[in-house]
């Protein structure tokens, strides 16, 4: 058992153009907290995925407000360390999410509104018991800078926090409440005791007696902030205006050690004390071999070229990052063609496509009409993935299966008598009606309604039954012509819907794999 | 140095079963996805199946020809990996290695199985 | 499954050859291709991972190339010890896949 440390030191805008200005949207002021995430060393860093190792949730910050026209500072953080309290052993390696979250206090209906601001992610390697971490980390235009380490709690000692230990005062025999003595090895000292007064926040101490701070803090207890200390004891030119040592950038100033690598100061220069697994002047060479697994997610990891240069990973489909620890999501690029969904299995991507369209990625037009022809002499007319048939006369129904009487709507006018026929219907209209639909009336003096019919189409014209037996003819000539197109497009699709279907097998065997 | 060994092959008969084991040494074991590949005879190589990691929920992956009937499983405290094959087949017969991550890179030395009447 | 096509399936060449092995997909794979050396009762030994890239300790004689469906394993000058079975193998999708191989043999 025992407990990750995190102290936040400031939070900000990173340097260069661009940078903002506030954290603070325009709608009034707010306040920041942050949320500390932690995962072993293995598992995914995607955010959603539990903090098996735990988490824990700052207090509020200070109200910000922005001041027009006033540079952005390090922002007003809440106060305290952030706790994270671990029952099993410390894994040693492990993902350190941070968030920086906003407050809006403005008028929000329903209360304050949160947003995240930044999140910073970091694998790192830290072995419980050592000194604080410290780190710089960008998330965008944001810079967090921030201290952490891994503490055991009595009676768990060690660099995992697995080793059981009483301080060497204490009997040999177990006292009430503690853990079973068995797996007792050696007798072990309790942890130092600080120098009285030393602040818990801003220092600690690694033998008894000391005080050390941490960055940004200064003085004897650790209790005075660097920019408003007192002129005694600061390095740095002397300031003519005030008398006093104005605070010089000091050479552990900005970390110069690498992959969380711990400063601290050195006549005139500095040293690194690097986490497990990182070497050189400025933690900047990884220790860690291919051997030691450090590709996630089956990652090939490829040593370098000589033994001081780092490994590479090389990444499975679907994952990126210098370790293939961040998933890519893929469907995000929008790869499915004509509304498919895109479904992401991991190390295949797959197109669900729409009814009418098949391919890899949809982009096969299937003819909605293929293989669905419409029956009796209906045309097929397709539209947005559906299909609809248009039937002839006589039929009706979806697929124009249901035989239709014609003439049940009474569509002969003015009298006229409806006779059923193949190709429709045919009216024998009332003395003084003529049309298709005996719809016009027949004037008395031998003229219509409508412009002089040439003569032998006058009602009652004997060539009348020969213009209907061409016409039927000419009908039957056009339903022919559609039912040998009909048959060549479901020719021309079959292979397109044999590839859907198998497309979608694969799909199901994948995603219940 | 890296090292896999299997080991665990051996004659059966058809509808009988068999386990292998790869031990690895030289490498941190629990960060490898850990594989099986089988050469038969003559042959070329086909994926049998896979095992990813605790933080994984030590997924398993298996290959449509033997899905049902053959079973991998990891111990991280012992260095190992396990095939349990049930209700083997003549075609079943080959060269079993055993492999680490997604694109094979260490193997192991093989261990034949055969399956026979 | 994505079949790989390797071909030829044999070939005979000499020490200081130019030899060169293909492989085709049955869809696009990317540069998700590796290659791998296998001899007599050896296991397979990874040579080209991402279809171009060299594996750790592999001689520069051996080279990579091609994306999407068309892939090429080229040994520059072939050695005594290049005498052996290639594979190719496709990691675009699960599963993966291999090829025939092709075996190297001396003229």
């Known amino acids: 058992a025992g407990v990750f440390e995190l102290q936040i030191h400031s939070f900000g805008p990173g340097p260069g153009p661009g940078a903002p200005r506030s954290p603070c949207s325009a709608r009034g002021p707010c306040r920041l907290f942050f949320r500390v995430c932690l995962k072993p060393g293995l598992s995914e860093e995607a955010a959603e995925s539990p903090c098996a190792l735990g988490a824990a949730l700052s207090a509020r910050g200070p109200v910000y407000t922005e001041q027009p026209e006033a540079p952005a500072p390090d922002l007003p953080l809440p106060n305290g360390l952030l706790q994270v309290p671990f029952r099993d052993a410390w894994p040693g390696t492990f993902s350190l999410i941070i968030e920086t979250w906003r407050e809006e206090l403005g008028d929000q209906i329903g209360g304050p509104a949160w947003s995240l601001l930044a999140r910073v992610t970091r694998r790192r390697r830290l072995a419980a018991g050592g000194p604080w971490a410290r780190d710089i980390q960008r998330a965008g235009a944001w810079e967090l800078r921030f201290s952490y380490r891994a503490r055991c709690e009595l009676p768990a000692v060690g660099t995992a926090c697995t080793r059981l230990c009483r301080p060497r005062s204490a009997p040999s025999r177990c006292g009430p409440g503690l853990r079973p003595c068995a797996p007792l090895e050696d007798e072990c000292e309790a942890p130092p005791v600080c120098r009285a007064g030393c602040s818990l926040e801003h220092g600690f101490c690694e033998q008894p007696g000391e005080c050390r701070c941490l960055e940004g803090w200064t003085g004897p207890l650790c209790m005075v902030p660097v920019s408003t200390s007192s002129c005694l004891g600061l390095r740095g030119p002397s300031s003519t205006t005030t008398g006093c040592l104005v605070p010089g950038p000091g050479p552990c100033d900005g970390n110069p050690c690498a992959n969380g690598g711990s400063c601290s100061e050195t006549p005139g220069s500095f040293e690194c004390t690097c986490p497990r697994g990182f070497y050189g002047l400025r933690c900047e060479v990884s220790g860690v071999t291919c051997a030691d697994g450090p590709c996630f997610n089956g990652g090939l990891c490829v040593g370098g070229a000589d033994p001081d240069s780092a490994y590479i990973c090389h990444c499975p489909p679907g994952f990126q990052g210098s370790n293939c620890e961040k998933r890519v999501d893929r469907c995000s690029l929008q790869p499915c063609r004509n509304g498919g969904l895109c479904l992401d299995l991991g190390h295949a991507l797959r197109c669900r496509c729409r009814a009418g369209f098949a391919g890899p990625r949809c982009e096969h037009d299937l003819d909605d009409c293929a293989g669905r022809a419409c029956a009796n002499g209906g045309t097929c007319v397709e539209g947005g993935g559906a299909h609809r048939c248009s039937c002839a006369l006589g039929f009706g129904g979806r697929n124009c299966r249901e035989r239709a009487d014609p003439c049940a709507a009474r569509p002969c006018a003015h009298g006229g008598r409806c006779y059923a026929h193949f190709s429709g219907l045919v009216c024998a209209c009332a003395p003084g009606y003529m049309g298709a639909r005996c719809e016009f009336p027949v004037h008395p003096d031998g003229v219509s309604a409508l412009p002089a019919a040439p003569p032998g189409l006058r009602p009652g014209d004997p060539q009348r039954a020969g213009v209907i037996a061409v016409i039927v003819v000419v009908v039957i000539a056009i339903v022919a012509g559609i039912v040998v197109l009909v048959i060549s497009r479901k020719k021309r699709m079959a292979k397109y819907e044999k590839a859907e279907i198998k497309e979608m097998g694969e799909m199901h065997r994948e995603l219940n794999a | 140095e890296v090292q896999l060994v299997e080991s665990g092959g051996g004659l059966v008969k058809p509808g009988g079963s068999l386990r292998l084991s790869c031990a690895a040494s030289?490498?941190?074991?629990?960060?490898?996805?850990m594989n099986w590949v089988r050469q038969a005879p003559e042959k070329g190589l086909e994926w049998v199946g896979q095992?990813?990691?605790?933080?994984?929920?030590?997924?398993?992956h298996y290959a449509e020809s033997v899905k049902g009937r053959f079973t991998i499983s990891r111990e991280d405290s012992k260095n190992t990996v396990y095939l349990q094959m049930n209700s083997l087949k003549t075609e079943d017969t080959a060269v079993y290695y055993c492999?680490?991550?997604?694109?094979?890179?260490?193997w192991g030395q093989g261990t034949t199985v055969t399956v026979s009447s | 499954n994505i079949q790989m096509t390797q071909s030829p399936s044999s070939l005979s060449a000499s020490v200081g050859d130019r030899v060169t092995i293909t492989c085709k997909a049955s869809?696009?794979?990317?540069?998700?291709v590796s290659w791998y050396q296998q001899k007599p009762g050896k296991s397979p030994k990874l040579l080209i991972y991402?279809?171009?890239n060299r594996y750790t300790g592999v001689p520069s004689r051996f080279s990579g190339s091609g994306s999407g469906t068309d892939f090429t394993l080229t040994i520059s000058s072939l050695q005594p010890e290049d005498f052996a079975t290639y594979y190719c193998?496709?990691?675009?999708?699960?599963?993966?896949?291999f090829g025939g191989g092709t075996k190297v043999e001396i003229k």
């Open positions: 492999t680490t991550g997604y694109y094979f890179d260490y």
């Open positions: 030289g490498i941190t074991f629990s960060n490898f996805w």
């Open positions: 095992i990813r990691l605790k933080s994984d929920d030590y997924a398993t």
């Open positions: 869809e696009n794979v990317g540069t998700y």
């Open positions: 991402g279809a171009s």
């Open positions: 193998g496709q990691f675009y999708s699960f599963p993966s896949t």
